[in-house]
């Protein structure tokens, strides 16, 4: 997991490489400015959306090379003993709220699975990532609104749950969890884009995705 420093770094999508490049450009231009991640993500997403297949090519090549690197490194990687042991999770603890992207996936996954029954879970996720990535900020708004509402509810629920006191096994992880909460939330804005948004394999000639008509 995240604990093993020897574990190969996860492979990056073309969109993640693009965001990284944007971030580097931004840092060069404004070295002292702090980044508003949601604004930055929105700008990146809009810019990616209007890029041509040729412009995206550079990032797709980077992603292909990184995928090859990851696969090569994973072949020789041996996970440490006890890696699979899961830390105690209280079944009564409030569930973490879904992200806007996750809510979006719940809407469109049935269609993609229904029309492409042979697709692997990974390929369905990739298609959903492409779709989200090609969705304008205005169109994402209802999902983001709902995700924010659920996050707000979760924060209230988790506060109440913590106030009540937890089972001893869970208590140990709480201090650490509290400390890392702020850092985690800052990182999440970036991870949402990088982990959840896959690249768009744009073709020169568009095809119809829908093949469901009876």
């Amino acid at each position: 997991g995240k604990g093993d420093p020897k574990k190969p770094r996860g492979k990056m999508s073309s969109y993640a490489f693009f965001v990284q490049t944007c971030r580097e450009e931004h840092k060069k231009k404004h070295p002292d400015a702090s980044v508003n991640f949601s604004e930055f993500s929105k700008k990146c997403s809009e810019r990616w959306k209007t890029m041509s297949a040729k412009e995206k090519g550079k990032f797709e090549d980077m992603a292909k090379a990184d995928k090859a690197r990851y696969e090569r490194e994973m072949k020789t990687y041996i996970p440490p003993k006890g890696e699979t042991k899961k830390k105690f999770k209280d079944p009564n603890a409030p569930k973490r709220p879904p992200s806007a992207f996750f809510l979006f996936c719940s809407e469109y996954r049935p269609k993609i699975k229904g029309e492409h029954p042979g697709l692997s879970i990974g390929d369905v996720a990739k298609k959903l990532g492409e779709m989200w990535n090609n969705t304008a900020a205005d169109d994402k708004q209802p999902y983001e609104k709902k995700a924010a509402k659920l996050k707000e509810k979760y924060e209230k629920d988790i506060a109440a749950y913590r106030a009540k006191g937890k089972p001893d096994a869970a208590k140990k992880g709480v201090v650490k969890a509290e400390k890392s909460k702020k850092k985690k939330e800052e990182e999440e804005d970036e991870e949402d884009e990088e982990d959840e948004e896959e690249e768009e394999d744009e073709e020169d000639e568009e095809e119809e995705e829908d093949d469901d008509d009876e």
Epitope: E107, K111, M131, K146, E205, E208, D213, E214
Partner: antibody, heavy 122, light 107 residues
């Protein structure tokens, strides 16, 4: 054959209400975004509203926000538009249409229903 | 909102003519642009989606091009059934917006 059939239009007084229905057939209704588009007599097309496949998420044109409500019943393959506080400027033919996506996730409207006329007049 | 401006608003042409209708977006929309044809008293019908892809069943005399802010619909050789009104529409964001339409009439 993919078909959309609107109903529920008619003459209504300003401030009144009307509920439009759109019956879908020939495709898996629950997979698709659905939209309402209207056309005032002798004028161009105006997008009105959109609803996500499950019905959980909705979008509206500013001109109808707070007055119109889009909904769907996937078990009945039917799309609805509840129109309240109607104004003279809402007079139009209302079309329901399906949002289709290309492999690059570009959306377009296909097919369209035949439309239902809503007249708001005293 | 993204404004879509079509030109010309109306156009007179003859059977066999080559006709071009243009559509301009108020901001860059990539290739998120569709073209529809509407005959009097009937619902619109999609001709071109994603700026240049021909909808199945639409004659090949219709073609679309452009990206960013400027788009064109071309009819290479007008047929009698092509005299109708044409609309462009952006699907880049919400609200979806249409051009005001171009009425194609017989000269």
């Amino acid at each position: 054959e993919v078909q959309l059939l609107e109903s529920g239009g008619g003459l209504v007084q300003p401030g009144g209400s009307l509920r439009l229905s759109c019956a879908a057939s020939g495709f898996t209704f629950s997979y698709y975004d659905m939209h309402w588009v209207r056309q005032a007599p002798g004028k161009g097309l105006e997008w009105v509203s959109r609803i996500s496949p499950s019905g959980g998420y909705t979008w509206y044109a500013d001109s109808v926000k707070g007055r119109f409500t889009i909904s769907r019943d996937n078990s009945k393959n039917t799309l609805y538009l509840q129109m309240n506080s109607l104004r003279a400027e809402d007079t139009a033919v209302y079309y329901c249409t399906r949002g289709r996506y290309t492999s690059g996730w570009h959306e377009y409207f296909d097919p369209w229903g035949q439309g239902t006329l809503v007249t708001v007049s005293s | 909102d993204i404004q879509m401006t079509q030109s010309p608003s109306s156009l007179s042409a003859s059977v066999g003519d080559r006709v071009t209708i243009t559509c301009r977006a108020s901001q860059s929309i990539g290739t998120y642009l569709n073209w529809y044809q509407q005959k009097p008293g009937t619902a619109p019908k999609v001709l071109i989606y994603a700026a240049s892809s021909l909808q199945s069943g639409v004659p090949s005399r219709f073609s679309g091009s452009g990206s960013g802010t400027d788009f064109t619909l071309t009819i290479s050789s007008l047929q009698p059934e092509d005299f109708s009104t044409y609309y462009c529409q952006q699907s880049y964001n919400t609200p979806r917006t249409f051009g005001q339409g171009t009425k194609l009439e017989i000269k």
